[in-house]
Interface confidence: medium
């Protein structure tokens, strides 16, 4: 069983809100991790969207609009990415990853390589 799990695809109507789920395997505690979200459009490198540890400890990627937001459900061991006012350009692959709080700056300051880290999962928003 992979460390992280995301549904392979999700869709919603334009203008609505969609919530992507990233579930961490039960032998890990999401409470101690920051959840990182990346977006990748076809033919483009991934870009960092946001990092979420808690409401008081989170960061948005540069120029990422506030309609992208993160949250966590510690009881269910899940991280969430909500995209409100869904737009055509939001059609993309979304990757979640877990990282320690302390490595926030290094984690979010790099684009990912073609081979995603083992702790990465993805959801396509068609």
């Amino acid at each position: 069983q992979p460390v992280l799990h995301q549904p392979p695809a999700m869709s919603s109507a334009l203008g609505t809100t969609i919530r992507l789920t990233c579930t961490l395997r039960n032998d890990h505690d999401i409470g101690v991790y920051s959840v990182y979200w990346y977006q990748q459009r076809p033919g483009h490198p991934p870009r960092f969207l946001l990092r979420y540890f808690s409401q008081s400890d989170k960061s948005q990627g540069p120029q990422v609009p506030p309609r992208f937001s993160g949250s966590k459900d510690v009881a269910r061991n899940r991280g969430y990415l909500s995209i409100s006012e869904l737009q055509p350009e939001d059609e993309a692959m979304y990757y979640c990853a877990m990282g320690a709080r302390s490595s926030e700056k290094e984690e979010r300051e790099r684009e990912w390589e073609e081979e995603m880290e083992p702790t990465a999962a993805r959801t396509r928003v068609p």
């Epitope: 033919g43 483009h44 540069p62 120029q63 350009e89 790099r110 390589e113 081979e115």
Partner: antibody, heavy 120, light 107 residues
Framework: EVQLVESGGGLVKPGGSLRLSCAAS????????MSWVRQAPGKGLEWVAY????????YYADSVKGRFTISRDNAKNSLYLQMNSLRAEDTAVYYC?????????????WGQGTLVTVSS | DIQLTQSPSFLSASVGDRVTITCRAS??????LAWYQQKPGKAPKLLIY???TLQSGVPSRFSGSGSGTEFTLTISSLQPEDFATYYC?????????FGGGTKVEIK
């Protein structure tokens, strides 16, 4: 202060080779995608090549594909463009440009440019 | 490849004029468009990204609008330092492409 300084331009004969370098300073080079953009004398801008921060994603303009190679050395804060089989139409000022962190595809900092002249 | 067509190619205007430059894309690019200003012998300077977001340090007299295939760059009140060539650029897909440029000259 962000600085990008190109070097390596000059006069070369058709069919020849040249290697351009771009020395970056004032920012964490290893976290940014970089591009080369060129401008022929009296003409507009033409994007040439892109490389992401870890070299895992590389793209080229059709006009240079198979002849030019973009690379980088993050330890040296340097970007390179190896140009082979040069043609007269490659004559241009070559700019090194930093991709915006959020997209990589638009450029918030540019070097001063280095002139490449291909002529017999 | 996505083609960008800028109009006009040349524009004569006076200080204080309101100037509008148009950029049309050959296919829809949402808001993946940037605008640059270039002065003779200098490197381009980013003015606007994401079609309408002003780059830090750029005067507020510059504004961008549009989405899909039609975009505009507006200078609300032309200043002496604004006489330059302006380029649009799409980053919707690779290869990245630029418009042909619009040269703004003193009338």
């Amino acid at each position: 202060e962000v600085q990008l300084v190109e070097s390596g331009g000059g006069l070369v004969k058709p069919g020849g080779s040249l290697r351009l370098s771009c020395a970056a300073s004032g920012f964490t080079f290893s976290t940014y995608g970089m591009s080369w953009v060129r401008q022929a004398p009296g003409k507009g801008l033409e994007w040439v090549a892109y490389i992401n921060n870890g070299s895992g994603y590389i793209y080229y303009a059709d006009s240079v594909k198979g002849r030019f190679t973009i690379s980088r050395d993050n330890a040296k804060n340097s970007l390179y463009l190896q140009m082979n089989s040069l043609r007269a139409e490659d004559t241009a000022v070559y700019y090194c440009a930093r991709g915006q962190w959020w997209s990589g595809g638009d450029f918030d900092y540019w070097g001063q440019g280095t002139l490449v002249t291909v002529s017999s | 490849d996505i083609q960008l067509t800028q109009s006009p190619s040349f524009l004569s205007a006076s200080v204080g004029d309101r100037v509008t430059i148009t950029c049309r894309a050959s296919q829809g690019i949402n808001t993946w468009l940037a605008w640059y200003q270039q002065k003779p012998g200098k490197a381009p300077k980013l003015l606007i990204y994401a079609a309408s977001t002003l780059q830090s340090g750029v005067p507020s007299r510059f504004s961008g609008s549009g989405s899909g295939t039609e975009f505009t760059l507006t200078i609300s009140s032309l200043q002496p330092e604004d006489f330059a060539t302006y380029y649009c650029q799409q980053l919707n897909s690779y290869p990245l492409t630029f418009g042909g440029g619009t040269k703004v000259e003193i009338k």
